[in-house]
Amino acid sequence: YPNASPLLGSSWGGLIHLYTATARNSYHLQIHKNGHVDGAPHQTIYSALMIRSEDAGFVVITGVMSRRYLCMDFRGNIFGSHYFDPENCRFQHQTLENGYDVYHSPQYHFLVSLGRAKRAFLPGMNPPPYSQFLSRRNEIPLIHFNTPIPRRHTRSAEDDSERDPLNVLKPRARMTPAPASCSQELPSAEDNSPMASDPLGVVRGGRVNTHAGGTGPEGCRPFAKFI
């Protein structure tokens, strides 16, 4: 689904956050300065990511503040590395029928997940919610990101003189308008109706439509309800 990708959509303004979402909570994938990867209930400077599309649906995910690439070892553990290894630091991106995104290692086949278990990706599978991601536009002021992005430390490294070659730290004009949020709701649970148990809407946080051609009305992706 190359055209349904957050990588190509112009609405995300350079920096995005990948997050898992259940009916009640969400965790944002963050890459810490020491390379540790985990989830946070909110956007943090370490969950601000740059996702670059490569050939055949492959992506490279970068933690802007940690200046580390998201990588995976042979056991399926994800970690942040200053060095780009094409075998470990490229992921296959796929959009599931439910509109959520999964990322898996073409080398080791494991899914990127915020859960501790390591599961291989199989076509047609329904991964657990902590292995399915949505994307949100960055809401943290750009002044907090006054740091160079990582460069590939390989033989074909990019020009060291360019601190921000992709202009991810500079706001970009959007080529096409995108709705601020989607109004589609997930089916309400019979015993936990979102309207009944969440009258103030604290779990129905709006999210940016970062994927063109989504599954819901007006191209909206799944509407995640979380606090």
Epitope: N25, G115, A117
Partner: antibody, heavy 117, light 106 residues
């Protein structure tokens, strides 16, 4: 090491309110949601609600809507659960539990709340 | 909401027995299932997460399996300290618990 320490047992009269605290230590408080679960005597576990430690936003099971209030104090890494309009069937042990994305990995020791006239 | 049912609701077994507890979800929950052990007067203890992953520090005689709607917790050789109540919990949408299975001494 991670610890969740809850306040002591309470005895309340029907119609009153009770506020139970849960003090977290040994981890970054704002990095994990916190849940409240209760267990009536001889019964199973019942999920009550969840609180986002950074924003304070909450979401409750429909059964408790309007009666339960969850709050947090980030300065002391403490979450609170207040249950109002108590009735005898609210007699239970109340637990706080830390969310680890894929499980509740740490639990408080529990707080017994007895509602009796 | 997704409902969880456990069977049996209670069972009597002897030390050394192989014990199997099942948990069924009312709809598919992938592998987002957790098992806890609870002893009287104590808080629940995490045993298995993601349906089949053993939590650190939990003895290897405990194992979990299943995906979708049907899940199993197995204790390969019951030990004296394993007499307790076991709960499943789904993590797919809300945080529903199963009703529990009490394992007592035959």
């Amino acid at each position: 090491q991670v610890q969740l320490v809850q306040s002591g047992a309470e005895v309340k009269k029907p119609g009153a309110s009770v506020k139970v605290s849960c003090k977290a230590s040994g981890y970054t408080f704002t990095n994990h949601y916190m849940h409240w679960v209760r267990q009536a005597p001889g019964q199973g576990l019942e999920w009550m609600g969840i609180i986002n430690p950074i924003s304070g936003s909450t979401s409750n099971a429909q059964k408790f809507q309007g009666r339960v209030t969850m709050t947090r104090d980030t300065s002391t890494s403490t979450v609170y659960m207040e249950l109002s309009s108590l009735r005898s069937e609210d007699t239970a042990v109340y637990y706080c539990a830390r969310d680890r994305v894929d499980a509740f990995d740490f639990w408080g020791q529990g707080t017994m709340v007895t509602v009796s006239s | 909401a997704i409902q969880l049912t456990q069977s049996p609701s209670s069972l009597s077994a002897s030390v050394g027995d192989r014990v199997t507890i099942t948990c069924r979800a009312s709809q598919g929950i992938s592998s987002a299932l957790v098992w806890y052990q609870q002893k009287p007067g104590k808080a629940p203890k995490l045993l298995i997460y993601d349906a089949s992953s053993l939590e650190s520090g939990v003895p290897s005689r405990f194992s979990g399996s299943g995906s979708g709607t049907d899940f199993t917790l197995t204790i390969s050789s019951l030990q004296p300290e394993d007499f307790a109540t076991y709960y499943c919990q789904q993590f797919n949408d809300y945080f529903t618990f199963g009703p529990g299975t009490k394992v007592d001494i035959k």
